[in-house]
Interface confidence: low
């Protein structure tokens, strides 16, 4: 059964522009990617960006690029004033889903916190088979 | 020309190895997967594994009867594929095909060595 | 694993000749399901991907289509250059071939 990660990338030297990488180890065929996240814009559930191997991507603000980074991967590039990036990250979680072939939905979420040191999680190992 | 060839393959007894090779010319080896399949006498097509490119970590996956016996390797700088088949048994005599993929959004093997034979029998 | 399921096992046909095979399979794969050719003594060839999709330098003549569980290959006029063995392949790992379709002269 795939494993989802997410990490998410802060620039040091602009809190206004973060990434988040979200992707699924081992063999998958994927058909569809929805990155979201709570407690960031409003209460509840934000769509950032659903992403289609196929028929392209769509993305909502505050994310400013949505693309795959490998066929396993993709990347989310979010920008929003820095007033607001620093008060509100704290409470933010982010999250992956990844419909795939044959194993259907899987969710990973990632909290920030303010104790996470730069808000950056450890990069996974990529070990994935197909191109 | 995009081209596999594979070599290595003869007679071996049971019990014993035999590690096989694909050479790729006419294109970039370390973008993609390589798959290798068999196919015994008079017999369909079966996979064995494939190794990933290099770029997705080069990791592997193998059909349940060869697993742990069988290893899939790749050398970037010479663009081989390798397949190191251990504790070799009768009934895993075939043509060994290697082949390029699988890859996204095809999945499809788009090229495909000659073939080696390789027969187990004491 | 995902069984897939092709029929006929053989037939005989002759040139220019409509030629279907169908491939089953299991479960569910949706659309990832490949088409191979494979001459006697020779390696497969890549015909179809993804169900529908004609691959490079493959003759129109060859078509697919399916989703799901069910899938077909055609052959809408055949050439002698057609005769051979046919399998249809689903990309879910550990990735399964049917049993194949011998394509005869009559």
């Known amino acids: 059964s795939p494993e989802v990660w997410v990490q998410v990338q802060m620039e040091a030297t602009n809190l206004s522009s973060f990434s988040v990488h979200c992707g699924v180890l081992g063999y998958s065929l994927i058909s569809l990617v929805t990155v979201s996240c709570e407690g960031f814009v409003d209460a509840g559930r934000t769509k950032l960006a659903v992403l289609h191997p196929e028929f392209g991507t769509q993305q909502w603000a505050p994310a400013r690029q949505a693309h795959w980074e490998t066929p396993n991967s993709v990347s989310v590039t979010l920008t929003m004033g820095q007033s607001k990036a620093r008060s509100s990250l704290a409470n933010t979680t982010f999250c992956c889903e990844f419909v795939t072939f044959p194993h259907g939905s899987r969710v990973a979420c990632r909290d920030l916190h303010r104790s996470d040191p730069g808000l950056s999680a450890p990069t996974p190992a990529l070990n994935l088979q197909a191109d | 020309e995009v081209q596999l060839v594979e070599s290595g393959g003869g007679l071996v007894q049971p019990g014993r190895s035999l590690r096989l090779s694909c050479t790729a010319s006419g294109f970039t080896f370390g973008d993609y997967a390589m798959s290798w399949f068999r196919q015994a006498p008079g017999k369909g097509l079966e996979w064995v594994g494939f190794i990933g490119s290099k770029a997705y970590g080069g990791t592997t996956e193998y059909t349940a009867s060869v697993k742990g016996r069988f290893t899939i390797s790749r050398d970037g700088s010479k663009s081989i594929a390798y397949l190191q088949m251990n504790s070799l048994k009768t009934e895993d005599t075939a043509v060994y095909y290697c082949a390029r993929g699988p890859r996204r959004y095809t999945y499809g093997m788009d090229v495909w060595g000659q073939g080696t034979t390789v027969t187990v029998s004491s | 694993d995902i069984q897939m399921t092709q029929s006929p096992s053989s037939l005989s046909a002759s040139v220019g000749d409509r030629v279907t095979i169908t491939c089953r399979a299991s479960q569910s794969i949706s659309s990832y399901l490949n088409w191979y050719q494979q001459k006697p003594g020779k390696a497969p060839k890549l015909l179809i991907y993804?169900?529908?999709s004609l691959q490079s330098g493959v003759p129109s003549r060859f078509s697919g289509s399916g989703s799901g569980t069910d899938f077909t290959l055609t052959i809408s006029s055949l050439q002698p250059e057609d005769f051979a063995t046919y399998y249809c392949q689903q990309s879910s790992t550990p990735l399964t071939f049917g049993g194949g379709t011998k394509v005869e002269i009559k």
């Open positions: 993804a169900a529908s």
